[in-house]
Interface confidence: low
Amino acid sequence: VTGSRVYPANEVTLLDSRSVQGELGWIASPLEGGWEEVSIMDEKNTPIRTYQVCNVMEPSQNNWLRTDWITREGAQRVYIEIKFTLRDCNSLPGVMGTCKETFNLYYYESDNDKERFIRENQFVKIDTIAADESFTQVDIGDRIMKLNTEIRDVGPLSKKGFYLAFQDVGACIALVSVRVFYKKCPLTVRNLAQFPDTITGADTSSLVEVRGSCVNNSEEKDVPKMYCGADGEWLVPIGNCLCNAGHEERSGECQACKIGYYKALSTDATCAKCPPHSYSVWEGATSCTCDRGFFRADNDAASMPCTRPPSAPLNLISNVNETSVNLEWSSPQNTGGRQDISYNVVCKKCGAGDPSKCRPCGSGVHYTPQQNGLKTTKVSITDLLAHTNYTFEIWAVNGVSKYNPNPDQSVSVTVTTNQAAPSSIALVQAKEVTRYSVALAWLEPDRPNGVILEYEVKYYEKDQNERSYRIVRTAARNTDIKGLNPLTSYVFHVRARTAAGYGDFSEPLEVTTNTVPSRIIGDGANST
């Protein structure tokens, strides 16, 4: 039965003579006259089992003391700590040269835990032990004892266990404590990696490389390794683990971020408070949820505040210049907390009679500098149709506008472009040709660009080649040209006029009047 004594964490005790209750019962040779088990009292009046020998008067002493079998427990090297008191030979009266101030320490490896006798030739010498000059004075009961402590090591060991032996060659000595232990590097956590109990190597300079395992809720950054030194101390840690997302290092552990905090990545940073306009409702959050009406763009870092779409632009002003419109506006009152605001222009062409019937303007309209993604608060729109109702919407957008289910970030203005000269008339037809007259009809211009006030028909005899022409004006899209010469080729041009002026003449229509009183009906541009 052994009592509990406290030793360094890196030492595993295999034998401690001071922890044994009752007699030690080690084997001595000779059985009498050599080593003797004696109980003395320590400072707490507790008995200590010691072995003493003081055969200093007789020469050629050879007294052996052997321990019980000691299990190796996987250790390749063990340490023997001996606390002893040894008297100076000079302090012993009448002792001649036979007195010694040393004793010898031996060991013998064996798989047999029941060997009854000491066979000296089986034992291997570890060292000769002498009293150190520096000793600890310990109060043992009513006496001050000069207590020396010596530690030796032995290895590599390979059998299941071993015996220790002490050889006295003529000293006056008391073994107060014998402790046998091996060294381990104790379980430890360094840089969030746990390193297991590791028995030291076989020799005093060996290093045992040990790979650590990351503590719960952490992952390797660099492979965590340490070396277990022969003295049972961990040497130079390499690599480390990092707390997983949603966890931070606290007291050497990776603990979940508290509610209201988060950590997005596996780093050595601590959990951060949720950014503005966001929250976390569980421990271990890797990101925070945006408040209602607030959003986070795809490329927004988890550390950025949640933001919302901007409000509508303000103070939209339009300036119409013929078929161009310049629009200018002010930034929204609320940018949603973002810097990436831009503007999109939506152009709609609306009917004069029913302004609600609008349709997109199409690709013919041009925007300067651009239609979408405007960074400035003005735009110039050109190539519009004249005398047309347009509605322009200016949309304020930012990185989270696309997440908004109820957009209300636009301001609009409706304008009518100025009248302009009409386009040319595409088709002029001779509907009826007689000897003295031609009945003409035509279509309205593709782009009237305003209210058509009248049409102007210019005609001349072909061989006169426009040196002498006549003009007829009409509000209708047809007219009868009378007073022509029979059997004569005439060229006709038609153009339209709005308040803004005349358009271009149509392509020439060539018609030849008849020689007989009959009528000729023609649709072609060059009736003959």
């Epitope: 104790p186 300079s205 130079v236 840690p237 290092e249």
Partner: antibody, heavy 121, light 106 residues
Framework: QVQLLQSGAEVKKPGASVKVPCKAS????????MSWVRQAPGQGLEWMGW????????TYAQGFTGRFVFSLDTSVSTAYLQISSLKAEDTAVYYC??????????????WGQGTLVTVSS | EIVLTQSPATLSVSPGERATLSCRAS??????LAWYQQKPGQAPRLLIY???TRATGIPDRFSASGSGTDFTLTISRVEPEDFAVYYC????????FGQGTKVEIK
């Protein structure tokens, strides 16, 4: 007792080399790493790196690669710092220090007395 | 690399007074921090390792605390032999020293 003994002051010309020894005694030389620390005149301490006395494997701090070499002679329990192509800005006291690593933390628990290297033309 | 910033640069105290020195890391070094004392013309001396563990032979008037990024060295009652420069040093990632705090007689 445990101690580290360094050589006396050195005066070198720019471009020359210097080899600073650090002899250990009083403990098992190969049980502790050896660190090197620089201190320019009137300045603070700068960690240069360390060498594993078991394997001879050196680790250099930023700014101390190339011209600086750590080496060992375990038979005489001595670590060396060699600096080549010396520059005026290498003028400093160079310390060796034993690295003690325990369960509770690391520290340089035993220091040499330092070697002053002066680089001057 | 991790930068250690010590404050104040100079601390003036009278013998018997309490001295508090600060060391702040640019990122967490856990408890991987040591404190050293250096007197003029001498090599540095290890005072504290593991952020708070006194080295062998260091008087108990020296104490230290902190972890992560903020660390403190306290001398409870300054003795005449304590006037020196004090350095913090981290070994969490590579090794670096602070720029030092000089403790001088007031």
């Amino acid at each position: 007792q445990v101690q580290l003994l360094q050589s006396g002051a050195e005066v070198k010309k720019p471009g020359a080399s210097v080899k600073v020894p650090c002899k250990a005694s009083g403990y098992t030389f190969t049980s502790y790493a050896m660190s090197w620390v620089r201190q320019a005149p009137g300045q603070g301490l700068e960690w240069m790196g360390w060498i594993n006395t078991n394997t001879g494997n050196p680790t250099y701090a930023q700014g101390f690669t190339g011209r600086f070499v750590f080496s060992l002679d375990t038979s005489v329990s001595t670590a060396y710092l060699q600096i080549s192509s010396l520059k005026a800005e290498d003028t400093a006291v160079y310390y060796c220090a034993r690295v003690r690593t325990t369960v509770y933390g690391d520290g340089m628990d035993v220091w040499g007395q330092g070697t002053l290297v002066t680089v001057s033309s | 690399e991790i930068v250690l910033t010590q404050s104040p640069a100079t601390l003036s105290v009278s013998p018997g007074e309490r001295a508090t020195l600060s060391c702040r890391a640019s990122q967490s070094v856990s408890s991987n921090l040591a404190w050293y004392q250096q007197k003029p013309g001498q090599a540095p001396r290890l005072l504290i390792y593991g952020a708070s563990t006194r080295a062998t032979g260091i008087p108990d008037r020296f104490s230290a605390s902190g972890s992560g990024t903020d660390f403190t060295l306290t001398i409870s009652r300054v003795e005449p032999e304590d006037f020196a420069v004090y350095y913090c040093q981290q070994y969490g990632s590579s090794w670096t020293f602070g720029q030092g705090t000089k403790v001088e007689i007031k």
